[in-house]
């Protein structure tokens, strides 16, 4: 069976693929696709934001390409960016550390 | 419950805490902590691929501060290469695609 | 209300390189926003250089990209081009601009425009 | 790099008109079309984003409409304060291109 990293990069690049597989470029996410995604997939990260404005900032924040779309380069990018803050938050709570050097 | 990509970022986290933790700096993976994180939890990355140089070469190109360790960041852009390498391998296969748009 | 004003020299003498700098006023100069620089040639249409904007993420345009410089001092709400090796063909009104995080990214926000003329 | 064609370069009408303004895009934009407006001797002002959406503060006398690689600016009822010169955008890939521009004039 394969190890827990492992099934995460495998959930990583499956969940891309079930939303940009829904319309336009079948390798990218357009905006529409991006916002079911998030909905869907990451509501502890969306929260309350769900107005369109913040869509849109959030969408241009990740288009470092400037085609409107995220390909799967800048969708890595972004879901690293989530990890980096669960680890700061992670970081923030010694107790629920691994043990101490 | 959370969501499978929610708990793929919480593995992530989880995993790179489970082993910077053993020796040194808690919050940094040295060389043999990445050397048990690759063997343990990324098998089918690494492979046959377990000689002293791969691995050398595998930490310098990892360490892009070249503080001989690696921190939470570095560690993310490792793990969103070998998802874009999932990713390639995923998109050459037409069959195994979400249907066509 | 945002404003942006372009500064730099308006004469640049041939082979030397152009420096120009534009002061956004009226809104923080936040990562939501790309900061361009387009230039209009004398009674001619108008061309996109390149941009700078989250992450300090810069593309140029191809044509421009080997003599081109972008950078941002976002402590002083500015953000700065420099094009090397000019000739007259460089002879333009350069404006800066903020492209929108609305689809299609448009230039929603034009300085007035400096002319900047390349003569020895 | 895609090509914006704007093919009429100058257009001549009456106060009051509807005018109507073209702009060919060489390949598909997916409907990511912007239009601008240059005064004499002034600035450019965004106009309508995204084909057919207003920009705040626009008259709504401007209205854009289009699809593909075909788009197009109406002016529904001319005022004087609209005689300038107007440019269309691609906002679909980089680099950003536009379009030559076509110049409004009175008759």
């Known amino acids: 069976m394969a190890c827990p990293l492992e099934k995460a990069l495998d959930v990583m690049v499956s969940t891309f693929h079930k939303y940009s597989g829904k319309e336009g470029d079948k390798f990218k996410l357009n905006k529409s696709e991006l916002k079911e995604l998030l909905t869907r997939e990451l509501p502890s990260f969306l929260g309350k934001r769900t107005d369109e404005a913040a869509f849109q900032k959030l969408m241009s924040n990740l288009d470092s390409n400037r085609d409107n779309e995220v390909d799967f380069q800048e969708y890595c990018v972004f879901l690293s960016c989530i990890a980096m803050m669960c680890n700061e938050f992670f970081e923030g709570f010694p107790d629920k550390q691994p043990r101490k050097k | 419950m959370a969501c499978p990509l929610e708990k793929a970022l919480d593995v992530m986290v989880s995993t790179f805490h489970k082993y910077s933790g053993k020796e040194g700096d808690k919050f940094k993976l040295n060389k043999s902590e990445l050397k048990e994180l690759l063997t343990r939890e990324l098998p089918s990355f690494l492979g046959k691929r377990t000689d002293e140089a791969a691995f050398q070469k595998l930490m310098s190109n990892l360490d892009s501060n070249r503080d001989n360790e690696v921190d939470f960041q570095e560690y993310c852009v490792f793990l969103s290469c070998i998802a874009m390498m999932c990713n390639e391998f995923f998109e050459g296969f037409p069959d195994k695609q979400p249907r066509k748009k | 209300q945002v404003q942006l004003q372009e500064s730099g020299p308006g004469l640049v003498k041939p082979s030397q390189t152009l420096s120009l700098t534009c002061t956004v006023s009226?809104?923080?100069?936040?990562?939501?926003?790309?900061w361009n620089w387009i230039r209009q040639h004398p009674g001619k249409g108008l061309e996109w250089i390149g941009h700078i904007g989250y992450g300090g993420n810069i593309n140029y345009n191809p044509s421009l990209k080997n003599r081109l410089s972008m950078s941002r001092d976002t402590s002083k709400n500015q953000f700065s081009l420099k094009l090397s090796s000019v000739t007259a063909a460089d002879t333009a009104v350069y404006y800066c601009?903020?492209?929108?995080?609305?689809?299609?990214?448009?230039?929603?926000?034009w300085g007035q425009g400096t002319l900047v003329t390349v003569s020895s | 790099d895609i090509q914006m064609t704007q093919t009429t370069s100058s257009l001549s009408a009456s106060l009051g008109d509807r005018v109507t303004i073209s702009c060919r895009a060489s390949q598909d934009i997916r409907n990511y079309l912007n239009w601008y407006q240059q005064r004499p001797g002034g600035t450019l002002k965004l106009l309508i984003y995204?084909?057919?959406r207003l920009h705040s503060g626009v008259p709504s006398r401007f209205s854009g409409s289009g699809s593909g690689t075909d788009y197009s600016l109406t002016i529904s009822n001319l005022e004087q304060e609209d005689i300038a010169t107007y440019f269309c955008q691609q906002g679909n890939s980089l680099p950003r291109t536009f379009g030559g521009g076509t110049k409004l004039e009175i008759k």
């Open positions: 009226g809104d923080s100069f936040t990562n939501d926003y790309y």
């Open positions: 601009t903020r492209e929108s995080f609305y689809d299609g990214y448009p230039f929603d926000y």
């Open positions: 995204y084909t057919s």
